[in-house]
C-alpha cells in the first residue's frame, strides 16, 4: 500500500528572463527513493539517480540547474516555459509517486508565488 504524499510548490508564476525553483517533497512513507525524474509535459528535463547522480537533458543544459536538494532551478525563463511540470519519485518498495507543478511565465513584473498544495 502506498502511504506517501508529495508536497509541491504548487501553482507558481515568474517573470520572463528570471529564474524559478521547482520543488517536491515526498513524505509519510518509509520507502527508499531510488530516482527522481523531472519532466515538462512529455519532455525529460533531468534525472537524479541514487547511484549515478544527476543527468540534465542536453537540450536544457544551459537553462536548468539541479537543486536545491532534489529540486530543479529553471533559468532564463521564456513565455514558452509556461506549462505543467512533474516530479516523479521512483521508490522501493512503494513504486512511483508523481507531483504536479504549473508554472506561468509572465511578461510583466507582477509575478507572485501561488499557494502550496498536496497531492496524495
Amino acid at each position: 500500500m502506498m502511504t506517501g504524499t508529495i508536497e509541491t510548490t504548487g501553482n507558481i508564476s515568474a517573470e520572463k528572463g528570471g529564474s524559478i525553483i521547482l520543488q517536491c517533497h515526498l513524505s509519510s512513507t518509509t520507502a527508499q527513493v531510488t530516482q527522481v525524474n523531472w519532466e515538462q509535459q512529455d519532455q525529460l528535463l533531468a534525472i537524479c539517480n541514487a547511484d549515478l547522480g544527476w543527468h540534465i537533458s542536453p537540450s536544457f543544459k544551459d537553462r536548468v540547474a539541479p537543486g536545491p536538494g532534489l529540486g530543479l532551478t529553471l533559468q532564463s525563463l521564456t513565455v514558452n516555459d509556461t506549462g505543467e511540470y512533474f516530479c516523479i519519485y521512483h521508490t522501493y518498495p512503494d513504486g512511483t509517486y508523481t507531483g504536479r507543478i504549473f508554472l506561468e511565465v509572465l511578461e510583466s513584473s507582477v509575478a507572485e508565488h501561488g499557494a502550496r498544495f498536496q497531492i496524495p
Epitope: E7, H25, L26, S27, T30, V33, Q35, V36, C48, N49, A50, L52, G53, W54, H55, I56, K61, A65, P66, G67, P68, G69, L70
Partner: antibody, heavy 117, light 107 residues
Framework: QVQLQQPGSELVRPGASVKLSCKAS????????MHWVKQRHGQGLEWIGN????????NYDEKFKNKGTLTVDTSSSTAYIHLSSLTSEDSAVYYC??????????WGQGTTLTVSS | DIVLTQSPATLSVTPGDSVSLSCRAS??????LHWFQQKSHESPRLLIK???QSISGIPSRFSGSGSGTDFTLSINSLETEDFGMYFC?????????FGGGTKLEIK
Amino acid sequence: QVQLQQPGSELVRPGASVKLSCKASGYTFTSYWMHWVKQRHGQGLEWIGNIYPGSGTTNYDEKFKNKGTLTVDTSSSTAYIHLSSLTSEDSAVYYCTREGLYPFDYWGQGTTLTVSS
Amino acid sequence: DIVLTQSPATLSVTPGDSVSLSCRASQSIRNSLHWFQQKSHESPRLLIKYVFQSISGIPSRFSGSGSGTDFTLSINSLETEDFGMYFCQQSNSWPYTFGGGTKLEIK
C-alpha cells in the same frame, strides 16, 4: 570505490591566498554537486558553498562570498576552493563532500589550513 | 537563511542508555533534514537522510523522526563507539546550513 582526496595540511602567511584541492575518483565527477565545509578547531560545521561540475553553477553562503571562490577542473576530476586575504579566522579544517540524490554521503579527509606568520 | 538549533549542547550518558537529540529549524524545511556523526579527528559521517531514511552500513539503533521544523535523532542502547558530535543539516534551500551540534559524552 568513491574517494575524495585532500592534502593533509597547508601553512600560509596572513594576507596571502591559498588554493585547496579535492580530487574525486570512483564516480562521474560532473554528475554530483561538490560542497565545501569549514570547521574551526573544536567548533561546528559551516557550509561555504557548492559547485556543480556539469555546468559550473555555484552557490555561496553570503558570509563566504568575498572569501572563497569555487572552481573545478573536469579533466582531472578535481574541485578547488581559492581562499583570499587570509587571517587567523580562516585557520580551520576544510572538507569537500559530494551531493547526489542526498547530501554528503562521501567526505574528504579534510585539509588543515593554518594561517600564521 | 534557515537556522538549525540543536539541543542539548552536551549530553552525558552511560553506555546502554537510550537518548534523543533535538534539531529545530527556524522555518519549515519539510523533510530535507539529515543527521551526521563526527568523532574526534575524523570527517563527518552520514547517519540518516531525509528525516528517517536509513543509510547502508549504519546500525539500526540509529533512527530519526519529525517533520516541518522539529526533528529528533534517537539512539537506542548506546555503545561506546557512539560517543562524539552529532550535527543536523538541511538541504531545503541554499545556503545549506548545519546545526551547532550536540556532544554526546560518557558520564
